[in-house]
């Protein structure tokens, strides 16, 4: 089994992830592992020499780069926050701040914007991944209500008056909760007709 550096006539290497073809010498050389870079290129008699990335820099992949990439912070002005730090083997992991969604994507999110409000009677449809898109508001399902304009408020179940030893004074709607009253209390004048029936 050939160990780098080894000759390659067909310009391909046995292990594509960990080796690369060096055309000048027509040989296969070792790539440097994540967290390192090439400090000395390979030759026919010597394999690649790798060195650790300096602080605040990284390389994520097996590579034959002569430098490491600079770590970049998550930009709060662009609505981003850090979820995992940069290390020698991985760039900083960012996400949209709470209440925001990704509005510009170039391999990763570069800019977040505020989520739209959902009006009373609706709620934001739950997404698989938070911050991936703007809110899509959907009506509250039967027996539920939501009474604010908010990007994050959830529809709540209507109060069941009988569970509290009360009776229903006014039914709940998609935008308001059930109104309950003490069973001994008289009904308001506008509802007295309903009671008589």
């Amino acid at each position: 089994q050939a160990v780098p550096p080894y000759a390659s006539e067909n310009q391909t290497c046995r292990d594509q992830e960990k080796e690369y073809y060096e055309p000048q010498h027509r040989i296969c050389c070792s790539r440097c592992p994540p967290g390192t870079y090439v400090s000395a290129k390979c030759s026919r008699i010597r394999d690649t020499v790798c060195a650790t990335c300096a602080e605040n820099s990284y390389n994520e992949h097996w590579n034959y780069l002569t430098i490491c990439q600079l770590c970049r912070p998550c930009d709060p002005v662009m609505g981003l926050e850090e979820i995992a730090p940069c290390t020698s083997k991985r760039k900083t992991q960012c996400r949209c701040q709470p209440g925001m969604f990704c509005a510009a994507w170039a391999l990763e999110c570069t800019h977040c914007e505020l989520l739209s409000d959902c009006p009373p009677g609706t709620e934001a449809e739950l997404k698989d991944e938070v911050g991936k898109g703007n809110n899509h508001c959907v009506p509250c399902k039967a027996g539920h209500f939501q009474n604010t304009s908010s990007p994050s408020a959830r529809c709540q179940p209507h109060t069941r008056c009988e569970n509290q030893g009360l009776v229903e004074a006014a039914p709940g709607t998609a935008q308001s909760d059930t109104t309950c009253k003490n069973p001994l209390e008289p009904l308001p004048p506008e509802m007295s007709g309903t009671m008589l029936m």
Epitope: G35, A54, E60, I83, K89, R90
Partner: antibody, heavy 121, light 113 residues
């Protein structure tokens, strides 16, 4: 040979202080992050604190925040852990561990033999 | 914090038989950009410090016998000892290094039946 040797452990009363040291050899100390990891008798491993290669970044487990301070002297190839306001639950073997990274968030590829800290009255 | 849960707590296996240890993380530890799982396995023998045996979930540390193998992705991982030897008697720990703080499982003790 790559080696880490801890020292400074011992018996201390609750509320007392102790300073652990870890002498490193066989590698470019300043290029790598270091951590302290502890193991209470018969218990799990617990990461206590980490420091980046330059010493510019530090982090602590919630259980020791405000009581322990990690530091390093790259000219002496030595890592330290200053432990104040010690509690009975800090009783453990304390290991010094090297990360394969300038950041402490990584695999720990080299460990010292450990130093025992006992907090008891 | 990411919680690491190992099973079983202990395992008794005959010499030459296969030993399988499981580790589950409470959050995904796969980083999609480089398709690497930020998970390691350590072996700790009595009276000794832990020793790194597997990193990136499946890459053996140099000098570790090839009877040790790691597999899994995302949240579910396995350490397999294909043919248990007397010197493999130890406690095995998984650890995630996907996010701060790095966290460990509580270990699986491997003994000879």
């Amino acid at each position: 040979e790559v080696q880490l040797v801890e020292s400074g452990g011992g018996l201390v009363q609750p509320g007392g202080s102790l300073r652990l040291s870890c002498a490193a050899s066989g590698f470019t100390f300043s290029s790598y992050a270091m951590s302290w990891v502890r193991q209470a008798p018969g218990k799990c491993l617990e990461w206590v604190s980490g420091i980046s290669g330059s010493g510019g970044r530090t982090n602590y487990a919630d259980s020791v925040k405000g009581r322990f301070t990690i530091s390093r002297d790259n000219s002496k190839n030595t890592l330290y852990l200053q432990m104040n306001s010690l509690r009975a639950e800090d009783t453990a073997v304390y290991y010094c561990a090297k990360s394969d990274n300038w950041h402490y968030l990584d695999a720990f590829d080299i460990w010292g033999q450990g130093t025992m800290v006992t907090v008891s009255s | 914090d990411i919680v690491m849960t190992q099973s079983p707590d202990s395992l008794a296996v005959s010499l030459g038989e296969r030993a399988t240890i499981n580790c589950k993380s409470s959050q995904n530890v796969l980083y999609s950009s480089n398709n690497k799982n930020y998970l390691t396995w350590y072996q700790q023998k009595p009276g000794q410090p832990p020793k790194l045996i597997i990193y990136w979930a499946s890459t053996r540390e140099s000098g570790v016998p090839d009877r040790f193998s790691g597999s899994g992705s995302g949240t579910d991982f396995t350490l397999t000892i294909s043919s248990l030897q007397a010197e493999d008697v130890a406690v095995y720990y998984c650890q995630q290094y996907f996010n701060t703080p790095p966290t460990f499982g509580c270990g699986t003790k491997v003994e000879i039946k």
